[in-house]
């Protein structure tokens, strides 16, 4: 069964910077990845980045850089914008659309007692969606 993993990491050098890493574990080719702030019901809320293998990347502040790490994983660097962007308490969701499996989504957040430079363990809690 395909799975999506999510890691949220605070940068050791810049305490106001965070990186979200997401990956897809399963067969098939990735046609689209959407990263969003978590919303109600544990699913993605508002988009922060959309990555397409051929059409490129759209991203929205506070996202700084979205990129492919491998053919099945991506990273999104975020810039904390102060008190109104409580990344430490925020959920991030990654949704992978793959052919022929369909869409798989998982969410993760920074652990409450994260040391800078340490990442959250993978959290493959797939939300099955027949999109």
């Amino acid at each position: 069964t395909p799975e999506v993993w999510v890691q949220v990491q605070m940068e050791a050098t810049e305490l106001s910077s965070f990186t979200v890493h997401c990956g897809f574990l399963g067969p098939g080719s990735i046609s689209l990845v959407t990263v969003s702030w978590g919303g109600p019901d544990g699913a993605g809320g508002t988009k922060l980045a959309v990555l397409h293998p051929e059409l490129g990347t759209r991203q929205w502040a506070p996202a700084r850089q979205a990129r492919w790490e491998t053919q099945s994983s991506i990273s999104l660097a975020l810039e904390d914008s102060g008190a109104s962007s409580p990344f430490a308490n925020t959920t991030f969701c990654c949704k992978f659309a793959s052919f022929p499996e369909g869409s798989w989504e998982s969410c993760g957040s920074l652990p409450p007692s994260s040391d800078p430079g340490l990442s959250a363990p993978p959290t493959p809690v797939p939300i099955l969606r027949a999109d």
């Epitope: 702030w37 919303g39 508002t46 990347t57």
Partner: antibody, heavy 120, light 107 residues
Framework: EVQLQQSGPEPVKPGASVKISCKAS????????IHWVRQSHGKSLEWIGY????????GYNQKFKSKATLTVDSSSSTAYMELRSLTSEDSAVYYC?????????????WGQGTSVTVSS | DIQMTQSPASLSASVGETVTITCRAS??????LAWYQQKQGKSPQLLVY???TLAEGVPSRFSGSGSGTQFSLKINSLQPEDFGSYYC?????????FGGGTKLETK
């Protein structure tokens, strides 16, 4: 009926701060982002930033990052923008507008605007 | 940042005429473009999103077209209520930027 009701005109002194509000009604507040846009007299529109009401997360135009702070009070369905260290260059009409979370449909409802006049 | 260039800056036309406003993006924004109308002393109103989809309640005399870097807004058979300013805006990603505007005046 969807409405974004903004606070009234603000005459302020140079160097001061001002906080303007945008009260949403007629829809579920956390289902839409709230954006803020500036229009100086007789000029075009400039995007300042947005806030996601569900978690209070904000994204800013780098140009306004040291000028504006966006917050929300979900219990009253109200978004706020605080502007600091005001100069005459900041005299403008400031609008709030909503955008659905998928970000594919533009800003479909706008507030009536709040006029900020910076003068000694 | 993506720059949006609108032309013409101003335009005079009469009721019943057809006018076209153009907008150029400094890089490919696919179809992520919106058009807004603003009347004097009022807030902007969404007319078109995704380059060619009319917003709810917008009369069919308005039409948007284009993709990539070149876009246009066409108004057929101008009505008295159509005079005002028009702005394009990309929604490809932030920072969102607007065109300089086109002021449509009565001839």
């Amino acid at each position: 009926e969807v409405q974004l009701q903004q606070s009234g005109p603000e005459p302020v002194k140079p160097g001061a701060s001002v906080k303007i509000s945008c009260k949403a009604s007629g829809y579920t507040f956390t289902d839409y982002n709230i954006h803020w846009v500036r229009q100086s007299h007789g000029k075009s529109l400039e995007w300042i930033g947005y806030i996601y009401p569900y978690n209070g997360g904000a994204g800013y135009n780098q140009k306004f990052k040291s000028k504006a702070t966006l917050t929300v009070d979900s219990s009253s369905s109200t978004a706020y923008m605080e502007l600091r260290s005001l100069t005459s260059e900041d005299s403008a009409v400031y609008y709030c507008a909503r955008e659905e979370l998928r970000r594919d449909y533009g800003m479909d409802y706008w507030g009536q605007g709040t006029s900020v006049t910076v003068s000694s | 940042d993506i720059q949006m260039t609108q032309s013409p800056a101003s335009l005079s036309a009469s009721v019943g005429e057809t006018v076209t406003i153009t907008c150029r993006a400094s890089e490919n924004i696919y179809s992520y473009l919106a058009w807004y109308q603003q009347k004097q002393g009022k807030s902007p109103q969404l007319l078109v999103y995704n380059a060619k989809t009319l917003a709810e309640g917008v009369p069919s005399r308005f039409s948007g077209s284009g993709s990539g870097t070149q876009f246009s807004l066409k108004i057929n058979s101008l009505q008295p209520e159509d005079f005002g300013s028009y702005y394009c805006q990309h929604h490809y990603g932030t920072p969102y930027t607007f065109g300089g505007g086109t002021k449509l005046e009565t001839k």
